[in-house]
Structure formats: structure tokens, C-alpha cells
């Protein structure tokens, strides 16, 4: 069948007024204009550039589409450069919008804007709008747009002005046919052929089912005036889950997948994964196996590691060192780390609770890359269980039971806590009597207390100590009129506790006459 142009509308061929619908009436107006040959014709123009938010619609009469499936709309228009209109740069636009509305019959004079489908925003060719400011060159632009395929008996075209200075010189609607073909996995539909300005019309193809455009290489063909397809450019490629077979994309078979359209062929599922349906873009993991979110589809599914091996420990009073060997099975992954769970257990029934936040871990509790850790600040004489778990990138995806190595220990005796409530009971010229309270946590039997004292201005460069078994003592042989600093700590078999906070005490000044000085209460005297 010979290709043929079928005119549905040609505004230039109409000698009388076009009488299209303009809404609002103050928008588009029908005037006598000139075509490219300066022949008078009927045109529509609008130039509402002063006010913002323009919405001026112009609608053609109803166009019967005949046998057409796809329609060619050729617009010739003159658009005035906004720079040629002083003082309107904020409100002036240089585009307009082209719409269509399909219907089986003439719906009357009302333009129901919401029913219209936008075809495109039409702009003048850049070289046409660039004109000398003082000599505003206004050239004829030709823009062609395709609409369809159309399903109803006819349609309206509509032109929406949003604030441009524009004249529609010619509106031509027609169709021609190049028969639909499939090339490079793209369907090229029944298409209008070249207009009188060119022998070839470039047409963009639509990818076949389950195909998509290759990046930055969309499929195009040229429909000649003779109705033949020429010069294919670009292509479609089969989507993920599909591979090319002739002019179609077929789904990958069972046990195969294709994760990206960029891959040419379907591939067999990676280890520990499967696909039990056709058209898979990735394979599902077998039970007990997982993919981390960052794992690409082509890597094998993996599982959590087994428990660490050869867990050993070493206790030093209230500090425990743990050490272990890597798990026998890393689950097929190289991102194994370790985490420690500490539980404190009661003496009876072995009930355990998490240790809480006052326990210290060196270097850290979770995300351990080395196979050792030191746990500090445990309670003395307490039962603890430590679980050491190996973790990898899929451990948190697994719902199965955790695999860990565990060890239970009892801590030794800890040093006593700090002495509190140190008070000066009596202050004389050469002696001071102090009392204090037993530590809150003796952590064993207190064998003695040690009192450290020194002259304040000596700043601990030289100091003396005094030991006592009771919670009070008298410190003798002091200098009169001198400020001393006193600190006291408790001693047990486990070692020394921390010193109490400093207590400053000033001895009395020496009297001019000889005065009686009472003897110290404490039976323990300072060594001379």
C-alpha cells in the first residue's frame, strides 16, 4: 500500500474565519496575519505578557480522525522574544503547551481543561528567538508533534498560553503510514511519514514486552516518504529476568537468573540459591542461607558462622581475660567479628541476668576483630557466664538459634572501697585526732587502716604514714600552727582501697606560756 498523507485539518486552507473557541475571550484572538511568504492568512495570537499566571486556552473545532491511528500535528508559529518587550521579564514566557482531548463526538463550546492530555511544551527554536533587541526578528517556527494511537472517533487540539507573545500561523493535522515493525527489540508503530520539509521523520521505538531502552541509546528509526523504515539507531535490551530470542525477550528458565538488563544472557543460580520460577532477576537463598543487603545478586548465599572455638579465660580478682580461636565455619564470608555477652548468675538455681552497663570491655564488647577481650569492674566473689559469639554480615538475618562459646567463672576478692566520713575529733598544737567510717564495700575483712599525712605546703613531696586497726587515731609529733593534709585507706588481704578525699587540718599555734597538752586517745603512736 502506497504511503499517503491524509489531511485532517489545515488552518491555512480556510478562507473564512476559523472561529475556534478562546477561553477566556480576552486571551487568544483571531486576526489576519502573514505566513512565511507574507501571504495574508487567518491566525490566532495572544500577547498577555503583563500579568502573571496566565491561562489562556484556544481549542480547535472537533477533528474526525478517519482511519488514522497516529496523528501528526504540524504547528507554524511566531514567538516574540521576551527581551523585546521592556519591563515584562518577570511575567513573559517563551513557550506554550499543546494538548489534545479524544472524544467520539463534538462536545460543544465548553473547554474542560482537566480532560485534556498534554502532548508537549512547545518552544521556539533557539535561533529563531534570538533577535537584536532594537530590531526584533520574528521568524516562523515549525514544530511537529505526534499523538496517538487514538481510540475514539475524533479529538480536539488545544493550545494553552501561559504568558507568551505568540501567533499560531498554521495548524496542520494529518496522517501517513509506515507499517509497524520490530527492530532491535523495539516496536516502531504505524507512523506518519516525512512532511514536505524532509523526506525522513525520526520515530522513537517502544521496547517490546520485557525490554527497556539501553542507557543513553534510545531506539529510533526513520520513516521515509515511501513508507519504508530506514536507518535504525539505538536499541532496546531485555530487562532483568529476560534474555533475547529473536525479536522477543524470553524469561530465564528455572535455576537461572539475570540481575540486570546490561547482562546479555541468563546465568545459573549461585551456590546455595535457587529460582523455581521463570523470569527471575535474582535467585532466592536456600533455607539457612542469606544475602546481606550489600551482597550483589551474583554472589553465593551465605550463613552465620559457627561458634568460636577453644575459649579460655584468666581471672585476676575482678578482671577476666577471654581468648578464643576462630569458628570452624565462617559461613562463607570474610566479615567475621565477635561480640561478648556477660551474664551475672546467682548462687542458687543458676539464674542469670545481663551484667549491665557498669562493666568495662577492652578493646570493646561488639564488633571485635581480634580474638581476645578483657572484662573489667566485675563484682568480687560473684558468678559470671560469658558468651562469645562469632558474627558475620548475615547473622542478623538468621532466625535460627545463636551459636556461641560460653564459659562460667567466679571472681576473686576485690580491694575495699573508699573510706568515708573522715572527721577531725580534736586538734591541738602538736597532735590531731581523726575518726572515720568503715568502707561501704569492705570486700572482705579489713586488716588495718593506713593514714597518710603531710604538710600542705610540701605538696606530698614528703609524707608520713600511720597504721591502725580501729576507725580512729591520734597523729602526734606535729608542728604547731601548720596545715596538714590527711588521707585514709582501708587494707584487706586483697590489697589497698582508694584513699579518702583530702582533709586539711591546721594545728594550733604555740602558746607563749607553757601549757599542758593532753595525751592522744589512740593507743597507737607515731613513730618518732
Amino acid at each position: 500500500q502506497a504511503a499517503k498523507e491524509v489531511l485532517l485539518l489545515d488552518s491555512k486552507a480556510q478562507q473564512t474565519e476559523l472561529e475556534w473557541i478562546s477561553s477566556p475571550p480576552s486571551g487568544w484572538e483571531e486576526i489576519s496575519g502573514l505566513d512565511e511568504n507574507y501571504t495574508p492568512i487567518r491566525t490566532y495570537q495572544v500577547c498577555q505578557v503583563m500579568e502573571p499566571n496566565q491561562n489562556n486556552w484556544l481549542r480547535t473545532n472537533w477533528i474526525s480522525k478517519g482511519n488514522a491511528q497516529r496523528i501528526f500535528v504540524e504547528l507554524k508559529f511566531t514567538l516574540r522574544d521576551c527581551n523585546s518587550l521592556p519591563g515584562v521579564l518577570g511575567t513573559c514566557k517563551e513557550t506554550f503547551n499543546l494538548y489534545y482531548y479524544e472524544t467520539d463526538y463534538d462536545t460543544g463550546r465548553n473547554i474542560r481543561e482537566n480532560l485534556y492530555v498534554k502532548i508537549d511544551t512547545i518552544a521556539a527554536d533557539e535561533s529563531f528567538t534570538q533577535g537584536d533587541l532594537g530590531e526584533r526578528k520574528m521568524k516562523l517556527n515549525t514544530e511537529v508533534r505526534e499523538i496517538g494511537p487514538l481510540s475514539k472517533k475524533g479529538f480536539y487540539l488545544a493550545f494553552q498560553d501561559v504568558g507568551a507573545c505568540i501567533a499560531l500561523v498554521s495548524v496542520k493535522v494529518y496522517y501517513k503510514k509506515c507499517w509497524s515493525i520490530v527492530e532491535n527489540l523495539a516496536v516502531f508503530p504505524d507512523t506518519v511519514t516525512g512532511s514536505e520539509f524532509s523526506s525522513l521523520v525520526e520515530v522513537r521505538g517502544t521496547c517490546v514486552s520485557s525490554a527497556e531502552e539501553e542507557a543513553e541509546n534510545s531506539p529510533r528509526m526513520h520513516c521515509s516518504a515511501e513508507g519504508e523504515w530506514l536507518v535504525p539507531i539505538g536499541k532496546c535490551i531485555c530487562k532483568a529476568g529476560y534474555q533475547q530470542k529473536g525479536d522477543t525477550c524470553e524469561p530465564c528458565g528455572r535455576r537461572f537468573y539475570k540481575s540486570s538488563s546490561q547482562d546479555l544472557q541468563c546465568s545459573r543460580c549461585p551456590t546455595h540459591s535457587f529460582s523455581d520460577r521463570e523470569g527471575s532477576s535474582r535467585c532466592e537463598c536456600e533455607d539457612g542461607y542469606y544475602r546481606a543487603p550489600s551482597d550483589p545478586p551474583y554472589v553465593a548465599c551465605t550463613r552465620p558462622p559457627s561458634a568460636p572455638q577453644n575459649l579460655i579465660f584468666n581471672i585476676n580478682q575482678t578482671t577476666v581475660s577471654l581468648e578464643w580461636s576462630p569458628p570452624a565455619d565462617n559461613g562463607g564470608r570474610n566479615d567475621v567479628t565477635y561480640r561478648i555477652l556477660c551474664k551475672r548468675c546467682s548462687w542458687e538455681q543458676g539464674e542469670c541476668v545481663p551484667c549491665g552497663s557498669n562493666i568495662g570491655y577492652m578493646p570493646q564488647q561488639t564488633g571485635l576483630e581480634d580474638n581476645y577481650v578483657t572484662v573489667m569492674d566485675l563484682l568480687a566473689h560473684a558468678n559470671y557466664t560469658f558468651e562469645v559469639e562469632a558474627v558475620n554480615g548475615v547473622s542478623d538475618l538468621s532466625r535460627s538459634q545463636r551459636l556461641f562459646a560460653a564459659v562460667s567463672i567466679t571472681t576473686g576478692q576485690a580491694a575495699p572501697s573508699q573510706v568515708s566520713g573522715v572527721m577531725k575529733e580534736r586538734v591541738l598544737q602538736r597532735s590531731v585526732q581523726l575518726s572515720w567510717q568503715e568502707p561501704e564495700h569492705p570486700n572482705g575483712v579489713i586488716t588495718e587502716y593506713e593514714i597518710k599525712y603531710y604538710e600542705k605546703d610540701q605538696r606530698e613531696r614528703t609524707y608520713s604514714t600511720l597504721k591502725t586497726k580501729s576507725t580512729s587515731a591520734s597523729i602526734n609529733n606535729l608542728k604547731p600552727g601548720t596545715v596538714y593534709v590527711f588521707q585514709i585507706r582501708a587494707v584487706t588481704a586483697a590489697g589497698y582501697g582508694n584513699y579518702s578525699p583530702r582533709l586539711d587540718v591546721a594545728t594550733l599555734e604555740e602558746a607563749s606560756g607553757k601549757m599542758f597538752e593532753a595525751t592522744a586517745v589512740s593507743s597507737e603512736q607515731n613513730p618518732v
Partner: antibody, heavy 121, light 106 residues
Framework: QVQLLQSGAEVKKPGASVKVPCKAS????????MSWVRQAPGQGLEWMGW????????TYAQGFTGRFVFSLDTSVSTAYLQISSLKAEDTAVYYC??????????????WGQGTLVTVSS | EIVLTQSPATLSVSPGERATLSCRAS??????PPWYQQKPGQAPRLLIY???TRATGIPDRFSASGSGTDFTLTISRVEPEDFAVYYC????????FGQGTKVEIK
């Protein structure tokens, strides 16, 4: 119908000021620019400039900067021409004219009746 | 600035005759200038603008043509009410008028 109404004749002394109103009716005032045109006695037309009635932005022709000010009161659809430091050579009929912008060309499609300003000591 | 020169300064015609008024620009302008008619004691009136478009209410005996620098207003058959002064105008970066052509009764 569309109309531009200007005030009556004004007689002013040199150095004085005058403010000529131009009241628009019959259309949306802010949709069209307003031009001002001067015609001295027995002379031709001189375009003074225009004002964008939507933004209030004025454009002055050469020779009409400084003493000449275009302004608006959109609430009463009125454009104003103010001339300060009047000189004897400012004696003329001053017209306001609505600007018609089209793709093919511009023009002034509606004119006020003109206000004669006479500057004389 | 573009200067418009109108000729002749005065054109004497009889009613019913054809009148041709010229407007020449000092440099090329891309679109036809608008034309105005002014009768004594009256404000100017827009006759033709743009691509030879007659303003509302202007009879079809008025037409305009030309391109580049030379433009013409033609009154095909002059009527008594057509005797007036006619101005052309250019609308480049600044608008200017020609000095006018007076059409008088012969």
C-alpha cells in the same frame, strides 16, 4: 466600553509641579501597559515612555528622565504622570494611551482625550 | 535610536482617490510599524498595527505594507472623514513617531 479618562487643562507657573491622572475603565487595568505621549502645540507626537501596570516598573524615553515620573494607583485603575520643575517648553497636550502588544507589532489602541498643561509666568 | 521619516509632509487628494503615504526607517525594522490617524482637536487613533492588522472599527480601505526600511499606508478610496494627520511609529528598544503626513482635500 474601554475608556481612558484624563483630567482637564492645567495652568502652572515655571518651577511648579503637575500630576496628570488617567483613569481606566472597561478592562483589567493591570493586564495592559500604559504609555504617555506628548504633543506640543502644532507639533507631532512624542513618545515619553510606558509603565507596566502590573509591576509598576516604568520605562522612560530619552529626554524624559529625571523630571518625569510615571506612577499607579491600581486600586482605582489610575495611572499618573508627574512633571516637576516645569518649564515653558513643557507646554503641551499629554496623552495616556493603552499599549497593545502583539506578536507582529505593538501599538497604542486606546487613547485618553489628552490634558493640556500650560506653563506660563 | 531609529528615526522615522514620513513623506510627503502634506498630501492633497480628492475624495474617492487613492492615497499612498510613505514611512522610511533610518535602519531596518523587522515588523510593520503601526499607523495612527489624528484629527484636529482629537486624540490619535490606532489604524493598523502588526502584520497589517486593522484595529477595531477601521474600514478595509486602509491597508499597510512594506518591510525592512520602507513602509506604506494606503487608503484605497479616500472618504471625507479620512482627511487628517497620519503618523507611523516604530517600537524598537525605544518607541518613536514619524513627523506625520497631513492628508488634505485637493
Amino acid at each position: 466600553q474601554v475608556q481612558l479618562l484624563q483630567s482637564g487643562a492645567e495652568v502652572k507657573k515655571p518651577g511648579a509641579s503637575v500630576k496628570v491622572p488617567c483613569k481606566a475603565s472597561g478592562y483589567t487595568f493591570t493586564s495592559r501597559a500604559m504609555s504617555w505621549v506628548r504633543q506640543a502645540p502644532g507639533q507631532g507626537l512624542e513618545w515619553m515612555g510606558w509603565i507596566n501596570t502590573n509591576t509598576g516598573n516604568p520605562t522612560y524615553a530619552q529626554g524624559f528622565t529625571g523630571r518625569f515620573v510615571f506612577s499607579l494607583d491600581t486600586s482605582v485603575s489610575t495611572a499618573y504622570l508627574q512633571i516637576s520643575s516645569l518649564k515653558a517648553e513643557d507646554t503641551a497636550v499629554y496623552y495616556c494611551a493603552r499599549v497593545r502588544l502583539t506578536v507582529y507589532g505593538d501599538g497604542m489602541d486606546v487613547w485618553g482625550q489628552g490634558t493640556l498643561v500650560t506653563v506660563s509666568s | 535610536e531609529i528615526v522615522l521619516t514620513q513623506s510627503p509632509a502634506t498630501l492633497s487628494v480628492s475624495p474617492g482617490e487613492r492615497a499612498t503615504l510613505s514611512c522610511r526607517a533610518s535602519q531596518s525594522v523587522s515588523s510593520n510599524p503601526p499607523w495612527y490617524q489624528q484629527k484636529p482637536g482629537q486624540a490619535p487613533r490606532l489604524l493598523i498595527y502588526g502584520a497589517s492588522t486593522r484595529a477595531t472599527g477601521i474600514p478595509d480601505r486602509f491597508s499597510a505594507s512594506g518591510s525592512g526600511t520602507d513602509f506604506t499606508l494606503t487608503i484605497s478610496r479616500v472618504e471625507p472623514e479620512d482627511f487628517a494627520v497620519y503618523y507611523c511609529q516604530q517600537y524598537g528598544s525605544s518607541w518613536t513617531f514619524g513627523q506625520g503626513t497631513k492628508v488634505e482635500i485637493k
